[in-house]
């Protein structure tokens, strides 16, 4: 047993054009009240079919009189929750209808008049004991915002309100085989009431009304020992085998229900309980329409006016999935070029570009050399978002403005002396060395360790290498 609770947050004009006229006027003040109808499962029954899970009516809201010329605002609401008590287990999946009624308070003969302003319906999956679920539903130009939850009434606990809890009899622990009732640790699970007639020796249950058998026992009440002898012996055709039980594959093995449907065994086949938006033997057919509001995160729903046609959600930037339910990590696609840093701001994507690059995706390579002159005959070289000057001989520095000392780096090897020259530098080599940088030793026999000389040159001619 438990209670379904509905909290109406607002009822007023929906977004978009065509705001509805206020339901009340100075001449006809009125007040609102709400009705909720609940049905188990995901049935799309007519609004008139019985509210098998229960129904509730809210109190009347405050009297409202329209201000002339003002657009219809959110209308004043009744106080408190709508509560629908349920006596049996909470089914987990349910259909709801919420109706907004107007009570006119003018000078009607015979008392107030009632008229239906809006009706919204939907199918949802909900575990008892969970947090409040928020929802927005539209009916014509009206929008209803509400929250709902299902909670168990003590001593029932669990997602279906089927486990029972009792205050502890002993202060320290629960009875044999009984667990503490989280989150009420000071209470204990009560023994379950199994199916009537379930064998106390050979049967047990995990849900009320169930009868599960210990190994070696079978039958609906666990009173039949599992026979090792055969109940199918070779004999003539058309043999009746009443009472013969054989093991076999479970009807729901491998879960034949698609799209998250839950499977239950039936004598000849199986039955799928389909999640919101699906129907068919195996929940393989999508029955959601735009009226069900299937698009999340501000997605725009197109199509799906009749139950057999599909709908398409056009997702806003930053969301994807058939129902716009997944947030896109847009930076994972590395949209920023040239090493730019990606920032997903939710409503937009930003690229923070490295120096030398610009554009929404850092795709433009700025002309690094634009307006950058290299002095003294140097040439500008672009690259990596920064400019560089390739300086003429005798000059250096970022812009080739510094006169270079070619001898500063001590380019002459083996003690050779360096002289700056208008064309660069000249090395005067120490005895026994030769070459442009005095890098080659001269051997005593007159040969040198020079590389093979080009044709027409003598290996020992140092002047030609200066």
């Amino acid at each position: 047993a438990g209670v379904f609770e509905l909290q109406i947050h607002s009822f007023g004009p929906g977004p978009g054009p065509g705001a509805p006229r206020s339901p009340c006027s100075a001449r006809l003040p009125c007040r609102l009240f709400f009705r909720v109808c609940l049905k188990p499962g995901l049935s799309e029954e007519a609004a008139e079919s019985p509210c098998a899970l229960g129904a509730a009516l809210s109190a009347r809201g405050p009297v409202y009189t329209e201000q002339p010329g003002a657009p219809a605002p959110d209308l004043p609401l009744p106080d408190g929750l709508l509560q629908v008590p349920f006596r049996d287990a909470w089914p987990g999946t349910f259909s709801f209808i919420i109706e907004t009624w107007r009570e006119e308070l003018g000078d009607q003969i015979g008392g107030p008049a009632w008229s239906l302003l809006a009706r919204v319906a939907g199918r949802r999956r909900l575990a008892a004991g969970g947090p409040w679920a928020r929802d927005i539903q539209r009916a014509g130009a009206w929008e209803l915002r509400f929250s709902y939850r299902a909670r168990c009434e003590p001593p029932a606990v669990g997602t279906a309100c089927t486990r029972l809890c009792r205050p502890r009899s002993a202060p320290s622990r629960c009875g044999p085989g009984l667990r503490p009732c989280a989150p009420l640790e000071d209470e204990c699970e009560a023994p379950l009431v199994c199916r009537a007639g379930c064998s106390p020796e050979h049967g047990f249950c995990e849900q009320p009304g169930e009868c599960r058998c210990l190994e070696g026992w079978t039958g609906p009440l666990c009173t039949v020992p599992v026979s090792t002898s055969s109940c199918l012996s070779p004999r003539g055709p058309s043999s009746a085998t009443t009472g013969c039980l054989v093991p076999g594959p479970g009807p729901c093995d491998g879960n034949p229900c698609a799209n998250g449907g839950s499977c239950s065994e039936t004598p000849r086949s199986f039955e799928c309980t389909c999640p919101r938006g699906f129907y068919g033997l195996r929940c393989e057919v999508s029955g959601v329409t735009c009226a069900d509001g299937p698009c999340f995160n501000g997605g725009l729903c197109v199509g799906g006016a009749d139950p057999d046609s599909a709908y398409i959600c056009h997702c806003p930037p930053g969301f994807q999935g058939s129902n716009c339910e997944k947030r896109v990590d847009r930076c994972s696609l590395q949209p920023c070029r040239n090493g730019g840093l990606c920032l997903d701001l939710g409503h937009a994507l930003r690229c923070r570009c490295r120096a030398g690059f610009a554009g929404p995706r850092c795709e433009h390579d700025l002309d690094d050399c634009a307006g950058r002159a290299c002095a003294n005959g140097g040439t500008c070289v672009e690259g990596g978002g920064a400019h560089r000057c390739s300086c003429a001989l005798g000059f250096g520095g970022r812009d080739c403005r510094e006169r270079a000392d070619p001898c500063a780096a001590r380019p002459c090897a083996h003690g050779g002396r360096c002289y700056a020259h208008f064309s660069g530098l000249v090395c005067a080599c120490a005895p026994g060395y030769m070459g442009a940088r005095c890098e080659f030793p001269v051997h005593p026999d007159g040969a040198s360790a020079l590389p093979a000389a080009p044709p027409g040159l003598r290996p020992g001619d140092p002047q030609r290498y200066l």
């Epitope: 079978t218 109940c231 199918l232 009472g243 033997l281």
Partner: nanobody, 126 residues
Framework: EVQLVESGGGLVQPGGSLRLSCAAS????????IGWVRRAPGKGEELVAR????????RYADSVKGRFTISADTSKNTAYLQMNSLRAEDTAVYYC???????????????????SGQGTLVTVSS
């Protein structure tokens, strides 16, 4: 009068194939659940395959999954069991039976059989 008559059994080498037939009379198989039950020497019965022709529902025991295929021709009121890649452990008497799911207990699902045929022997041996 309800009758189920199996045929198609015989001796086959490992890796071979057989097709068993189950001709039903006295009821319409389209609206019933038909199963093939086997009894191997020294073992209990096991429902190896099951079909409900109304919705095309089929189920197989793990031991035969991927090798056996159950089917039904409602115009002939006949069910079939196509057995491929046969193994020595498939040797058994195979019965065709009208079956209904009964319950789950002791880690097994159980089926109640109300009518069955006389059985056909399948021997897999080299």
């Amino acid at each position: 009068e309800v009758q189920l008559v199996e045929s198609g059994g015989g001796l086959v080498q490992p890796g071979g194939s057989l097709r068993l037939s189950c001709a039903a009379s006295g009821f319409n198989i389209e609206y019933e659940s038909i199963g093939w039950v086997r009894r191997a020497p020294g073992k209990g019965e096991e429902l190896v395959a099951r079909i409900y022709p109304t919705n095309g529902y089929t189920r197989y025991a793990d031991s035969v999954k991927g090798r056996f295929t159950i089917s039904a021709d409602t115009s002939k009121n006949t069910a079939y069991l196509q057995m491929n890649s046969l193994r020595a452990e498939d040797t058994a008497v195979y019965y065709c039976a009208r079956s209904e799911y009964s319950h789950y207990s002791g880690s097994h699902h159980y089926y109640a059989l109300d009518y069955s045929g006389q059985g056909t022997l399948v021997t897999v041996s080299s």
